[in-house]
Interface confidence: medium
Amino acid sequence: MRTEAQVPALQPPEPGLEGAMGHRTLVLPWVLLTLCVTAGTPEVWVQVRMEATELSSFTIRCGFLGSGSISLVTVSWGGPNGAGGTTLAVLHPERGIRQWAPARQARWETQSSISLILEGSGASSPCANTTFCCKFASFPEGSWEACGSLPPSSDPGLSAPPTPAPILRADLAGILGVSGVLLFGCVYLLHLLRRHKHRPAPRLQPSRTSPQAPRARAWAPSQASQAALHVPYATINTSCRPATLDTAHPHGGPSWWASLPTHAAHRPQGPAAWASTPIPARGSFVSVENGLYAQAGERPPHTGPGLTLFPDPRGPRAMEGPLGVR
């Protein structure tokens, strides 16, 4: 795994965002701002966006900035998984995707980033101050989690700015290593901002690679420093969490199966039974660090299109094998 501070690839500003600031003067502060936000060796970014067309619909995008292969991604809301959070979707690179209401569509965007669209209707509608968390696991090296939310005052169609994750394990070496550069960069950024404070500045929309301060490496050098830097999870308003969601998939929840013909609703002996959308075909470079998954063809292929999964009322043994996540 890399230990240097990572700056995500920046995309060019979207049309209409340059405003009075020229392209060059816009990009440099943005790079520096990104550097400031990515201090502490970030690994996971989270972006929450409210759709302009459907005010109760949210899109959550999450990405992993490390170099290992992703074994599992869990998206939850209401806080981190295991700390009061409720699972919305579980994405597996080979076995596919499982999702629970109000998640409408979870999908892989790249081999290390995902997106999730949330339906917003009735009791299970998310609201602006809901916290969404993404946990990326790379077995057996570790897992990294970051959370984000949409500020209540955000305009529809705008993304949440990167905010520090409530779970934080900072890599001290990463912080110290870039602190000098950051100090200079942040001072210069302030200087630029002061220069432009009398000019009409456009409203910036963070690119989809906006980083989120992470739960940095679980194997950071010093456990003591991890403990010292651990930020307790803040209390959040959970009034928007659905009353019905936990009953939809109670602990030890049911098996999950796809709307396949009866003969197909059966777990094959191989581990490719999440009958849902697999990750797009991987290139040969993905035979990465933890060695769990190599190239796409090396596990049994999926036998169907992306399918909506729903709970099986017959209980945990409706299908062979342990399929229930929650």
Partner: antibody, heavy 120, light 106 residues
């Protein structure tokens, strides 16, 4: 039915070597990550080696690094643990276990164990 | 590496009684699992990712917790629940186990 059957344990002198085997059946062995976990006479559990499913990368805690080597033969559906420079503290019941990613990589199936005693 | 401490080391409960045992970590962990081991048998997975029951596990078992403190609860103790219970973490390699809680029937 998933089955894991360990063999190869026995009595060995300090500094000696031993190779444990775990025969797997009832599942697609090559796709799964596997571990060797030992249980000491005091009933403490310790994971001593893990191997990835497809790429076969290996992981060891410091207590056995350089002395133990995990490997697999996917054609034979068999997991191995080569132990060398054995010490008295390696005396334990050795289990092989499967990591199930539906269960977030918990060890969902374990063998019955094979006993290793290191004594002079 | 992460150290897991289980408490109490030994406890006893009457049939029908509620039982709770604790697993404490010296650092925040990502995933916690609970296993049950009966004398002469291999460990059996009970709970994964803090609170999810593995297949075939009775619903009287439940898991909870976050950060550094995790709990295994048996809502109504039964004779067959007498066993040793181990927690295990996966935040990074190596996976580590707690020292176990031995649950006896009164």
């Amino acid at each position: 039915e998933v089955m894991l059957v360990e063999s190869g344990g026995g009595l060995v002198k300090p500094g000696g070597s031993l190779k444990l085997s775990c025969a797997a059946s009832g599942f697609s062995f090559s796709s799964y990550s596997m571990s060797w976990v030992r249980q000491t006479p005091e009933k403490r559990l310790e994971c001593v080696a893990t191997i990835g499913g497809v790429g076969g990368n290996t992981y060891y805690p410091d207590s056995v690094k350089g002395r133990f080597s995990i490997s697999r033969d996917n054609a034979k559906n068999t997991l191995y643990l080569q132990m060398s420079s054995l010490r008295s503290e390696d005396t334990a019941l050795y289990y092989c276990a499967r990591h199930e990613d539906y269960y977030y990589y918990a060890m969902d199936y374990w063998g019955q164990g094979t006993s290793v005693t290191v004594s002079s | 590496q992460i150290v897991l401490t289980q408490s109490p080391a030994i406890m006893s409960a009457s049939p029908g009684e509620k039982v709770t045992m604790t697993c404490s970590a010296n650092s925040t962990v990502s995933y916690i699992y609970w296993y049950q081991q009966k004398p002469g048998s291999s460990p059996r997975l009970l709970i994964y990712d803090t609170s999810n029951l593995a297949s075939g596990v009775p619903v009287r078992f439940s898991g909870s917790g976050s950060g550094t403190s995790y709990y295994l609860t048996i809502s109504r103790m039964e004779a067959e629940d007498a066993a040793t219970y181990y927690c295990q973490q996966w935040s990074s390699f190596p996976f580590t186990f707690g020292s176990g809680t031995k649950l006896e029937i009164k």
